[in-house]
């Protein structure tokens, strides 16, 4: 005859307030005849948690059907967990006896402790934008978790980052803890569409980590490159000059044309296009009237991007006498 063993596989069970806790207990033998009861604590003052046969235990249900003939699973579920439920739970086998049943064997116990889930991580980027090749800092914060052990990882576009510092507070015992981590990220010119992710893993999350994200588009400024060109074709008395502003971010941009130092107020045609990497291109066309009196026209395209100092490009217009006379199309 096999000796009865009471198996409680979990030494520690972490549960969150309001949830249901499952306490496992299996037996290795049906003998001796008698009930299995659940208690919290030990000694004469121990608290009866569940007795299948009598008593009132509205928060407790059994995992399997205890009335099945050869049932060996005496696991229970306790609903609506509160802080008052913490403690060590024992499943205890009794042998039928007279006048009282006699305690025969106890399981090793499962300690139920309160776990609290971390809050959703909040990721904050720098207050001001920075240009590529520079380093920016992102912070990630999550609060209210217990126990203290927690894992935090940083990713940029799915690639794990290594340059970060993490602190968990407080250092001593507490009912709940907070984590704060700062990651240093080197910006690349193509980072407009990039994301940084802060990932928090905790025992209460059951393998499903929480993530907070920040878009690098909020942190990066890609300054434009300028090119001013004169179109080879001429329409009547007018020459078309193009200012191409390439690869900038964010979209905020002011463009002004100057003729020989004088700012031109007249309307100009322009188009804005978005590149695959999230940066923008802006093309502005400026029509210059050509007359005999205008031999030396210097055009300036000035761009003020995202509140930064203006940058400009100049073009000395090339108009040949032949072009003036013939009104024919010309290549400068």
């Amino acid at each position: 005859e096999e000796e009865l063993q009471m198996i409680q596989p979990e030494k520690l069970l972490l549960v969150t307030v309001g949830k249901t806790a499952t306490l496992h207990c299996t037996v290795t033998s049906l003998l001796p005849v008698g009930p299995v009861l659940w208690f919290r604590g030990v000694g004469p003052g121990r608290e009866l948690i569940y007795n299948q046969k009598e008593g009132h235990f509205p928060r407790v249900t059994t995992v399997s059907d205890l009335t099945k003939r050869n049932n060996m699973d005496f696991s229970i579920r306790i609903s609506s967990i509160t802080p008052a439920d913490v403690g060590t739970y024992y499943c205890v086998k009794f042998r039928k006896g007279s006048p009282e049943n006699v305690e025969f064997k106890s399981g090793p116990g499962t300690e139920m402790a309160l776990g609290a889930k971390p809050s959703a991580p909040v990721v904050l980027g720098p207050a001001a934008r920075t240009t590529p090749e520079h380093t920016v800092s992102f912070t990630c914060e999550s609060h209210g978790f217990s126990p203290r052990d927690i894992t935090l990882k940083w990713f940029k576009n799915g690639n794990e980052l290594s340059d970060f510092q993490t602190n968990v507070d407080p250092t001593g015992q507490s009912v709940a803890y907070s984590i704060r981590s700062t990651a240093r990220v080197v910006l690349d010119p193509w980072d407009v569409r990039s994301q940084v992710i802060c990932e928090v893993a905790h025992v209460t999350l059951q393998g499903d980590p929480l993530r907070g994200t920040a878009n690098l588009s909020e942190a990066i400024r890609v300054p434009p490159t300028l090119e001013v060109t004169q179109q080879p074709m001429r329409v009547g008395n007018q020459v078309n000059v193009t200012c191409q502003v390439r690869k900038f971010y964010p979209q905020s941009l002011q463009l002004t044309w100057s003729e020989n130092g004088n700012v031109c107020q007249r309307e100009t045609a322009s188009t804005l296009t978005e590149n695959k990497d999230g940066t923008y291109n802006w093309t502005s066309w400026f029509l210059v009237n050509i007359s005999d009196q205008r031999d030396d026209v210097v055009l300036t395209c000035q761009v003020k991007h995202d509140g930064q100092l203006a940058v400009s490009k100049r073009l000395a217009l090339e108009v040949t006498v032949h072009q003036k006379d013939q009104s024919s199309d010309a290549t400068p």
């Epitope: 608290e47 009866l48 009598e54 008593g55 009132h56 009335t67």
Partner: antibody
Framework: EVQLVQSGAEVKKPGATVKISCKVS????????MHWVQQAPGKGLEWIGR????????KYAPKFQGRVTITADTSTNTAYMELSSLRSEDTAVYYC??????WGQGTLVTVSS | EIVLTQSPATLSLSPGERATLSCSAS???????LYWYQQKPGQAPKLWIY???NLASGIPARFSGSGSGTDFTLTISSLEPEDFAVYYC?????????FGQGTKLEIK
Amino acid sequence: EVQLVQSGAEVKKPGATVKISCKVSGFNIKDYYMHWVQQAPGKGLEWIGRIDPEDAETKYAPKFQGRVTITADTSTNTAYMELSSLRSEDTAVYYCDRGLAYWGQGTLVTVSS
Amino acid sequence: EIVLTQSPATLSLSPGERATLSCSASSSVSSSYLYWYQQKPGQAPKLWIYSTSNLASGIPARFSGSGSGTDFTLTISSLEPEDFAVYYCHQWSSYPYTFGQGTKLEIK
């Protein structure tokens, strides 16, 4: 829904035997202890005993030991309480209850010559 | 056998007043095994408080239970007319199970 329905009132002569039934529904009688409690007119509650219908194991209060027999029929989901050698002081309402939580409506037994 | 002694036998109070019912055990009773029942005339007892301090389903929050060892208490913070009844404490810590003799809560 858990229900415990007891048999009707009984009038018995001293020395006779009474057998009260308690038919349950909403649960399997084998799963719980079935208790019996006495309440004499104007008096308090007194525990008589209980049965584990799964294996017919019984426990009785010393006061009733020898005169009371509690049985259960698992096929009909019914518990029984039989009290013999009735005397006038056995005049009372008898309750069955399931595991101390749910009670039957009571059965009045009057012992009178 | 564990003898349960309830006091007072009768408690006369008015609605709105606070009621304190005591139950004293002749030997120690684990709090898990101390129940209270309410009974009204012509009705079966109803489970009112289980495991010393837990209110059975549907029992108003003005009721509370406390105690340990040999001394247990049922308290009603502010009496309502429907609270007037007989209350019994009950132990099922050891055989034979026993009840207190009851406290009758009556309207003053």
